[in-house]
């Protein structure tokens, strides 16, 4: 590679790359230093090379770009903007590259970008306009179909004084740019709750992965609009029970498969409706593996084997009879 290779940008909306223009005519489609390229496979891999910036001289043919295991830290506006644009780039994997800041417009000028993986980056600062590229109330639709955001929660001491869930959701909803999103993975992010408006504004979702979070309840979450949803992963959360409204909504989704393993189900009187539903539904995958975690007397009991007599609640004592 050499500094004469192609690179760059749209100075109006991508100031970061406006200065990456080559000094001489670019050599056509050469491979950047520290990267491996296959023109036949339309793939460039710059993996585990401690890169601190996105290479400027990416070949125009690139369709699949792997920039994993680097030290990028920050993705500025127009980080992938080039002249001519990377018009073929469809899949971009940035996982494990120590990103903690993704700015507005970071993925602008990638007209074919369908898959984006930002997993395993401690995203303390994800701009609301990282995916929409503009702060307009309605942005141009993003081409993204698959967005992988597993384990992007920063360490606790690096989180800002705001809701991490809120920051992520703001980026997902900004400008309604992700209306075409079909797969969203948000596993392993310590989510305590799911903001109620997020799913309603992602109507094209087929696959939603919320596994390995800390979700306690789905009471305020509506799945009603997700008529195309095919898989919903809720394994390894802190769910205690699913209430009637949620059960009815899930049952009403025509193609859905729900995964509920490894949640601390509370098998008391509030669980009766869910047990009845589980016995009847074909929606839940591996439903025979679901077991009680509480109360102690019910621990490890299989939900499908419970009957209404098993599901009692301790009576609430009047205050005069309560002891400390």
């Amino acid at each position: 590679s050499s500094p004469t290779s192609s690179a760059s940008s749209f100075s109006s909306s991508a100031p970061f790359l406006a200065s990456a223009v080559s000094a001489q005519p670019p050599l056509p489609d050469q491979c950047p230093a520290l990267c491996e390229c296959s023109e036949a496979a339309r793939t460039v891999k710059c993996v585990n090379r401690n890169l601190t910036e996105v290479p400027t001289d990416l070949p125009a043919y690139v369709r699949n770009l792997f920039l994993t295991g680097n030290q990028l830290a920050v993705l500025p506006a127009g980080a992938f903007a080039r002249r001519p644009p990377l018009a073929e780039l469809a899949a971009l994997n940035l996982s494990g590259s120590r990103l903690d800041e993704v700015r507005a417009g970071a993925f602008e000028h990638l007209p074919s970008l369908r898959q984006l993986d930002l997993s395993h980056n401690p995203l303390a600062d994800l701009s609301p306009f990282a995916f929409s590229g503009s702060n307009a109330s309605v942005s141009a639709p993003s081409p993204l179909v698959e967005l992988i955001l597993n384990h992007i929660v920063p360490p606790e001491d690096e989180r800002q004084n705001r809701s991490f869930e809120g920051m992520v959701v703001a980026a997902l909803l900004a400008g309604r740019a992700l209306q075409g999103l079909r797969r969203l993975e948000l596993a392993s992010n310590h989510f305590l709750y799911l903001p109620r408006d997020v799913l309603a504004q992602l109507p094209s979702l087929r696959h939603l992965d919320l596994s390995n979070n800390s979700l306690v309840s789905l009471t305020y979450v509506s799945f009603r609009n997700l008529t195309h949803l095919e898989s919903l992963h809720l394994e390894d959360n802190a769910l205690k029970v699913l209430h009637n409204g949620t059960l009815a909504e899930l049952q009403g989704l025509p193609h859905i498969r729900v995964f509920l393993d490894n949640n601390p189900w509370v098998c008391d009187c509030h669980m009766a409706d869910m047990v009845t539903w589980l016995k009847e539904t074909e929606v839940v995958q591996g439903k025979d593996r679901l077991t009680c975690a509480y109360p102690e007397k019910m621990r490890n009991r299989v939900l499908l084997e419970l009957n209404s007599a098993d599901l009692d609640c301790d009576p609430i004592l009047p205050p005069s009879l309560q002891t400390s």
């Epitope: 100031p15 406006a18 990456a20 230093a33 890169l51 601190t52 800041e101």
Partner: antibody, heavy 120, light 111 residues
Framework: EVQLVESGGGLVQPGGSLRLSCAAS????????MHWVRQAPGKGLEWVAY????????YYADTVKGRFTISRDNAKNSLYLQMNSLRDEDTAVYYC?????????????WGQGTTVTVSS | DIVMTQSPDSLAVSLGERATINCRAS??????????LHWYQQKPGQPPKLLIY???NLESGVPDRFSGSGSGTDFTLTISSLQAEDVAVYYC?????????FGQGTKLEIK
């Protein structure tokens, strides 16, 4: 001790060319991005160009874009600036400088500079 | 391009007194993760030297009478007790985006 030593400056006519070099020692050169920064006589500092540690990224100031080319040879611990189509306004002391990254970095070591004079 | 404006252009301070230099960016150069603002000292006939990085972090080997503060667009370099060897020109610089730009410099002299 980190050392950066520039060379290659001199007097050149407008339209001419020069190649500056910067010899690095005292640190693992291949781990650091490198910049050229210049300072016109009696003026302030102006960033000129950047090259990443592995020569994957190159950036230039608008004032030199298309005329200057930054490059490096990690095997020789050397940084270069090829300067073509030189103009009067390129007259300056040229410093090479080290950084750990482009945006999250800063100029944490500097050479003593080499003087480029463009004049007819 | 981001314009960095320093004030004052020159400053005369008595030995042992406090010196304060300001730097203003034409747009924010801070994120919640990092502040992209750095300070340099340049003595006559010498190259610049890094003093403060990321607004407030003292570079190794720099005396602790130097300190930096600020975020967003407004930043300050403070010398708590001016020494004779602090006579120099001081520059702020942002690294928010390309092009990297410097302030015009502040010349610090002894009164």
């Amino acid at each position: 001790e980190v050392q950066l030593v520039e060379s290659g400056g001199g007097l050149v006519q407008p339209g001419g060319s020069l190649r500056l070099s910067c010899a690095a020692s005292g640190f693992t050169f291949s781990n650091f991005g490198m910049h050229w920064v210049r300072q016109a006589p009696g003026k302030g500092l102006e960033w000129v160009a950047y090259i990443s540690s592995g020569s994957t990224s190159f950036y230039y100031a608008d004032t030199v874009k298309g005329r200057f080319t930054i490059s490096r040879d990690n095997a020789k611990n050397s940084l270069y600036l090829q300067m073509n189509s030189l103009r009067d306004e390129d007259t300056a002391v040229y410093y090479c400088s080290r950084t750990n990254s482009l945006l999250r970095g800063f100029f944490d070591a500097w050479g003593q500079g080499t003087t480029v004079t463009v004049s007819s | 391009d981001i314009v960095m404006t320093q004030s004052p252009d020159s400053l005369a301070v008595s030995l042992g007194e406090r010196a304060t230099i300001n730097c203003r960016a034409s747009q924010s150069v801070s994120s919640s993760s990092y502040t992209y603002l750095h300070w340099y000292q340049q003595k006559p006939g010498q190259p610049p030297k890094l003093l403060i990085y990321s607004a407030s972090n003292l570079e190794s080997g720099v005396p602790d009478r130097f300190s930096g503060s600020g975020s967003g667009t407004d930043f300050t370099l403070t010398i708590s007790s001016l020494q004779a060897e602090d006579v120099a020109v001081y520059y702020c610089q942002h690294s928010w985006e390309i092009p990297l730009t410097f302030g015009q410099g502040t010349k610090l002299e002894i009164k």
